[in-house]
């Protein structure tokens, strides 16, 4: 494949990554699948710089990111190490709260209205952000 050199239409470039901000809501798994179909992934936040950029563009709205603990430990969807990486949880979070009455705990992370993170029920229909790296090879076949 060829290396992507600029962001697709309606995506926003920042620090060699491209971001797409949804305007509707989906469950975490549906949002995750949407990004994958776009040859991207749910946003992986690795620094304050990236946090601030995403936080401004989503506004004060609950928004899914690419972080979950559905299989036990917290994991970023692109394999970025969670334990040593950037974190911006709200106080007392994540708490895997079971009191919501929807069954199970809370396994998916989202940005809250002030930008800090919370874990919530993965079925909630929140907005989401896709991210893809500009330097990664696209899946399109090369032009002959």
């Amino acid at each position: 494949g060829s290396e992507r050199t600029c962001c697709p239409v309606n995506w926003v470039e920042h620090e060699r990554s491209c971001y797409w901000f949804s305007r509707s809501g989906k469950a975490w798994a549906d949002a995750d699948n949407y990004c994958r179909l776009e040859d991207a992934h749910l946003v992986v936040v690795t620094s304050w710089e990236e946090q601030k950029f995403v936080q401004h563009h989503i506004g004060p709205v609950n928004t899914w990111m690419g972080l979950h603990d559905q299989n036990g430990p917290w994991k970023w969807v692109d394999g970025t190490d969670y334990e040593t990486g950037f974190k911006n949880w709200r106080p007392e979070q994540p708490d895997d709260w079971y009191g919501h009455g929807l069954g199970g705990g809370e396994d998916c992370a989202h940005f809250t209205d002030d930008g800090r993170w919370n874990d919530d029920v993965c079925q909630r229909p929140y907005r989401w952000v896709c991210e893809t790296e500009l330097d990664k090879a696209s899946q399109e076949p090369p032009l002959l």
Epitope: E13, F21, W48, Q51, K52, F53, Q55, H56, G59, P60
Partner: antibody, heavy 118, light 105 residues
Framework: QITLKESGPTLVKPTQTLTLTCTFS??????????VGWIRQPPGKALEWLAL???????RYSPSLKSRLTITKDTSKNQVVLTMTNMDPVDTATYYC??????????WGQGTLVTVSS | SYELTQPPSVSVSPGQTASITCSGD??????VCWYQQKPGQSPVLVIY???KRPSGIPERFSGSNSGNTATLTISGTQAMDEADYYC????????FGGGTKLTVL
Amino acid sequence: QITLKESGPTLVKPTQTLTLTCTFSGFSLTTGGVGVGWIRQPPGKALEWLALIYWNDDERYSPSLKSRLTITKDTSKNQVVLTMTNMDPVDTATYYCAHIIAVAFQHWGQGTLVTVSS
Amino acid sequence: SYELTQPPSVSVSPGQTASITCSGDKLGHKFVCWYQQKPGQSPVLVIYQDRKRPSGIPERFSGSNSGNTATLTISGTQAMDEADYYCQAWDSSTVFGGGTKLTVL
């Protein structure tokens, strides 16, 4: 080259509605990450942010003025319109529109002075 | 509502370093921009995303942002740098500081 120009009345009466138009060139308001914002500056005072609109129709307003403001865009005309209701003499200011990219007001118009007086 | 505080005035001798501060609660968690405004002119962006310089802005302008304070630093200050400077914080919305008048003595 990016340019922006504000237009509208220079004098409005108290309680009237102000309508300002920002006409721009050199960028498209359909490009991801791009927006246009409005800022005002009373004579001899500080800048005050009013409102902004992004490529994806996301609108943001100053909390203290939100009930009085409406921002709209017309991408075919390369224009952004700000309306402000119930004008008062304290709203007398130079009103600027500005081009937003990379989370910053990167380019500004020349500004238009609006006086509110009976 | 969120507020940014700047000193009303800062004085500096030509060739010296001027530092203008901007303070706000957890300001380091937000992007900060700095604008220069000369009398009768529109503001000009000099720093964005805390520390980036737009093309055409001299290297003597630099920015930093951590904790509760952002700082605009002008090294080797020149007479032409005399102006009002405004900080601006971006969160879900945005807000300006009250401005600082920089005087080059």
